[in-house]
Interface confidence: low
């Protein structure tokens, strides 16, 4: 079914156009595998238009689809590193509301040093992603190397 | 902060759009990494909205946020051949104007022998990226192994 | 060349907008290496909003360019399981009609068990996108870790 | 079960050059950051930098900074603070500390040693 | 000189609740996580509260953690005499290159 009749005018506002790219703050302590993001430009690239973050984690403003990206390389990895502290496996997911919890990228090392991936999905205001990263590696903090964002693509 | 009242009419112009889908068309010269594209219809399915190309490399013609993202699939490769010659490392960044230059985006090859991400980025008029391959291993041209490309996403 | 003179209100159904998020369902018999994909609201996260699926494949509504992605992860796979079965490649092409038949994204895993890659190409009404995986492993249905979308980004 | 042994107490005099050091057992010592935190008597915590064993990335806090030295020898698990040049106002207990986190998680230590005391005197 | 100030003292009965505060600006406390330690005399601190507000295995739930702005409050509640110690909370610096900060420790006498 289309959005709307044909020639109906499309007011700016409504274009949405949130979008998010963070990079690595920090990871959690021992037994917390999230990611802790930070964004703005005084921090170089990284920048949110909508989104906020909470705690280091990204919550979405507004519902529609968004197109969700992901690299994250691990720091002072070779393959041997890689192969032999398998599995290192990093998730991203719906972490809040606990109602919506829902895993929505996954993807392991195995004899890399970086994963790289995206996707579509549907994503609600008051949405929050986190990413978990489980292993012993350590994520690189590299701006080049390691991000995350959001843009969303349609109501 | 929003980008305009609601109900202020979107003009097409406005919207932006530029995008931009290239194919390898050589390496360079051998103390030069860039790999140098190309685009157009006659091609094949690459092609230059907005964006041009100045020697091989991408110059953006509007400002905005952009999706960046790239594929390279090296030529006669195998995991082997992979770890053989590491490290084999692919990165984007802005080149031009010096004052603007920054690594924006990389990846190495490890075991594997293709690299495929993507990322969100502000862009200015006049930025050119450069996509630099290091290391002894060749790229594929093969159009659906290794193509590089942009999307602007919003103002 | 601009898409409209500046100030051309644009009608929110030439937005497009069209996109598609799959999920897999099945892969082929022995002799057709196609997976087969599924989506809507009721098997999760997947969606189609313009594209349809004929027999498993995606069928594209509405001419433009397009952002294509896909990320497909092995079953039951270690890294030397990947390299033990190598070569398994995953390719994304057109396939129907037959007179633009064209191979759009392909790459092998060698030693990975994921790969996921997107790319910009142009798309017409009525092409079918169909997404071979040859080899003998077999990829996962977890739908956080195979899954296949398209977002319609032009004219 | 994870253990940080430090060396023992020093007496020197200013001007003297030192190195103590704390070893690490019980876990991947690699994938832990070292802190040293200096205590001088009767006084609070303070934090002088911290160390990655794996590949020697070193952090130090600008009060810090030129006046001590942190390294690491990962072959034997021990990190080292170590001064060209003693002062009298060196004189203080020194604690090492780890840090499972990946990056500089603000101050969280989980793991500490015993402390070493460096009396600085003439 | 600390840029995290906490009371030099604090007091309690056994049995009693007590609040340690510990105050920074928007560029530690404000935009980053906050530990406590707890010293007893003369041993090395311990890790008492990570993240704001969470326990490492083995401290008791008598502990909590709490952040609200650019302060930060540790509370011990039924409190018992081996709580008499020094408490010191902790955090990252942006201002100070990412440097680790450490407040001015407060002593605490269960009488």
């Known amino acids: 079914q289309r959005f709307a009749q044909a020639q109906q005018q499309l007011p700016l506002e409504s274009l949405g156009w949130d979008v998010a790219e963070l990079q690595l703050n920090h990871t959690g302590p021992q037994q917390d595998p999230r990611l802790y993001w930070q964004g703005g430009p005084a921090l170089g690239r990284s920048f949110l238009h909508g989104p906020e973050l909470d705690k280091g984690q990204l919550r979405i403003h507004r519902d529609g689809i968004y197109m969700v990206h992901i690299q994250v390389t691990l720091a002072i990895c070779s393959s041997t590193t890689a192969s032999r502290h398998h599995p290192t496996t990093l998730a991203v997911g719906i972490c809040s509301p606990a109602s919506r919890s829902i895993s929505l990228l996954r993807l392991s090392f195995h004899q890399g040093c970086t994963i790289a991936s995206q996707r579509l999905t549907p994503l609600a205001r008051g949405d929050t992603l986190c990413t978990n990263l489980t292993g012993t590696l350590l994520p690189s903090r590299n701006t080049d190397e390691t991000f995350f964002g959001v843009q969303w693509v349609r109501p | 902060q929003r980008f305009a009242q609601a109900q202020q009419q979107l003009p097409l112009e406005s919207l932006g759009w530029d995008v931009a889908e290239l194919q390898l068309n050589h390496t360079g010269p051998q103390q030069d990494p860039r790999l140098y594209w190309q685009g157009g219809p006659a091609l094949g399915r690459s092609f230059l909205h907005g964006p041009e190309l100045d020697k091989g490399q991408l110059r953006i013609h509007r400002d905005g946020i952009y999706m960046v993202h790239i594929q390279v699939t090296l030529a006669i490769c195998s995991s082997t051949t992979a770890s053989r010659h590491h490290p084999t490392t692919l990165a984007v960044g802005i080149c031009s104007p010096a004052s603007r230059s920054i690594s924006l985006l990389r990846l190495s090859f490890h075991q594997g022998c293709t690299i495929a991400s993507q990322r969100l980025t502000p862009l200015a008029r006049g930025d050119t990226l450069c996509t630099n391959l290091t290391g002894t291993l060749l790229p594929s041209r093969n159009t659906d192994e290794t193509f590089f490309g942009v999307q602007w996403v919003r103002p | 060349q601009r898409f409209a003179q500046a100030q051309q209100q644009l009608p929110l159904e030439s937005l497009g907008w069209d996109v598609a998020e799959l999920q897999l369902n099945h892969t082929g018999p022995q002799q057709d290496p196609r997976l087969y994909w599924q989506g809507g609201p009721a098997l999760g996260r997947s969606f189609l909003h313009g594209p349809e699926l004929d027999k498993g494949q995606l069928r594209i509504h509405r001419d433009g360019i397009y952002m294509v992605h896909i990320q497909v992860t092995l079953a039951i796979c270690s890294s030397t399981t990947a390299s033990r079965h190598h070569p398994t490649t995953l390719a994304v092409g057109i396939c129907s009609p037959a007179s633009r038949s064209i191979s759009l994204l392909r790459l092998s895993f060698h030693q990975g068990c994921t790969i996921a890659s997107q790319r910009l190409t142009p798309l017409a009404r009525g092409d079918t996108l169909c997404t071979n995986l040859t080899g003998t492993l077999l990829p996962s249905r977890n739908t956080d870790e195979t899954f296949f979308g398209v977002q319609w980004v032009r004219p | 079960e994870v253990q940080l042994v430090q060396s023992g107490a020093e007496v020197k005099k200013p001007g003297e050059s030192l190195k103590i050091s704390c070893k690490g057992s019980?876990?991947?010592?690699?994938?832990?950051?070292i802190g040293w935190v200096r205590q001088m008597p009767g006084k609070g915590l303070e934090w002088m930098g911290i160390?990655?064993?794996?590949?020697?990335?070193?952090k130090y806090s600008p009060s810090f900074q030129g006046q001590v030295t942190i390294s690491a020898d990962k072959s034997i698990s021990t990190a080292y603070l170590q001064w060209s040049s003693l002062k009298a106002s060196d004189t203080a207990m020194y604690y090492c500390?780890?840090?499972?986190?990946?990056?500089?998680?603000?101050?969280?230590?989980?793991?500490w040693g015993q402390g070493t005391l460096v009396t600085v005197s003439s | 000189q600390s840029v995290l100030t906490q009371p030099p003292s604090a007091s309690g009965t056994p049995g009693q609740r007590v609040t340690i505060s510990c105050s920074g600006s928007?560029?530690?406390?404000?935009?980053?996580?906050v530990n406590w330690y707890q010293q007893l005399p003369g041993t090395a601190p311990k890790l008492l509260i990570y993240?704001?507000?969470q326990r490492p295995s083995g401290v008791p739930d008598r502990f909590s953690g709490s952040k609200s702005g650019t302060s930060a409050s540790l509370a011990i509640s039924g409190l018992r005499s081996e709580d008499e110690a020094d408490y010191y909370c902790?955090?990252?610096?942006?201002?100070?290159?990412?440097?680790?900060?450490f407040g001015t420790g407060t002593k605490l006498t269960v009488l």
């Open positions: 902790a955090t990252r610096d942006d201002s100070l290159s990412g440097s680790v900060v």
């Open positions: 019980g876990y991947g010592f690699t994938s832990y950051w």
């Open positions: 993240g704001d507000y």
């Open positions: 500390a780890s840090s499972y986190l990946r990056g500089l998680w603000g101050g969280y230590f989980d793991y």
């Open positions: 160390i990655h064993p794996d590949d020697s990335d070193t």
């Open positions: 928007s560029s530690n406390i404000g935009s980053n996580y």
